[in-house]
Interface confidence: low
């Protein structure tokens, strides 16, 4: 029987060009975590394996950093990064636990735009 629960950072927002930490935590189970997959919709971002450590998908290696812990740090955010992210915990003997995070990447504030393009 699967007794565990996944806690996530939930719905979060960050500014374009910035970075954000995606975090999940599995609790209420004694199951052994063998691997955690981080996925964005149908794309694999990264894998953290209990024995082999981290593997970052080649297409994301310039913008994704492992950690802290089993979390994932996304860097150089773009508006296209907006969407659902999933942490998938593979455990034994329980099975698979999945957590969902929604990230919204916002344009820089109007004030910043105004200051940046102000005509002297």
């Amino acid at each position: 029987m699967m007794t565990g629960t996944i806690e996530t950072t939930g719905n979060i927002s960050a500014e374009k060009g910035g970075s954000i930490i995606l975090q999940c935590h599995l609790s209420s189970t004694t199951a052994q975590v063998t691997q955690v997959n981080w996925e964005q919709q149908d794309q694999l971002l990264a894998i953290c394996n209990a024995d082999l450590g981290w593997h970052i998908s080649p297409s994301f290696k310039d913008r994704v950093a492992p950690g802290p812990g089993l979390g994932l740090t996304l860097q150089s955010l773009t508006v296209n990064d907006t969407g659902e992210y999933f942490c998938i915990y593979h455990t034994y003997p329980d099975g698979t636990y999945t957590g969902r995070i929604f990230l919204e990447v916002l344009e820089s504030s109007v004030a910043e735009h105004g200051a940046r393009f102000q005509i002297p």
């Epitope: 063998t34 691997q35 894998i47 394996n49 209990a50 024995d51 082999l52 593997h55 593979h90 034994y92 003997p93 698979t96």
Partner: nanobody, 123 residues
Framework: EVQLVESGGGLVQPGGSLRLSCAAS????????MGWFRQAPGKEREFVAA????????YYADSVKGRFTISADNSKNTAYLQMNSLKPEDTAVYYC????????????????WGQGTLVTVSS
């Protein structure tokens, strides 16, 4: 090309023992986790045991704990499944499989498979 070749299957009486071998080639054996699965006639393929690439971590299905032992010899590129106290319900085709991110216990997490070796436990 990855190749996994199982051997060691056969007919054995209840309570007997067998040792299955899985010879691997085509990849860096020590960087992959190895798993054993089995499929009985008319049933789905099920997880039996797995061992991490380092050999430190091992995993077993509840039905074989205490009776089966998985091991690996990196120098021989071979994984083993020592099966003791065999029961008729252990009768199945046994497959070995490799995973670069294992050890995991779902068959979908393993990318390469052997052709299988038949184990029959009967008096």
């Amino acid at each position: 090309e990855v190749q996994l070749v199982e051997s060691g299957g056969g007919l054995v009486q209840p309570g007997g023992s067998l040792r299955l071998s899985c010879a691997a080639s085509g990849f860096t054996f020590g960087h992959y986790a190895m798993g054993w699965f089995r499929q009985a006639p008319g049933k789905e393929r099920e997880f039996v045991a797995a061992i991490s690439w380092s050999g430190v971590s091992t995993y077993y299905a509840d039905s074989v704990k205490g009776r089966f032992t998985i091991s690996a010899d990196n120098s021989k590129n071979t994984a083993y499944l020592q099966m003791n106290s065999l029961k008729p319900e252990d009768t199945a085709v046994y497959y070995c499989a490799s995973s670069p991110y294992g050890p995991l216990y779902r068959s979908t997490h393993y990318y390469d498979w052997g052709q299988g070796t038949l184990v029959t436990v009967s008096s």
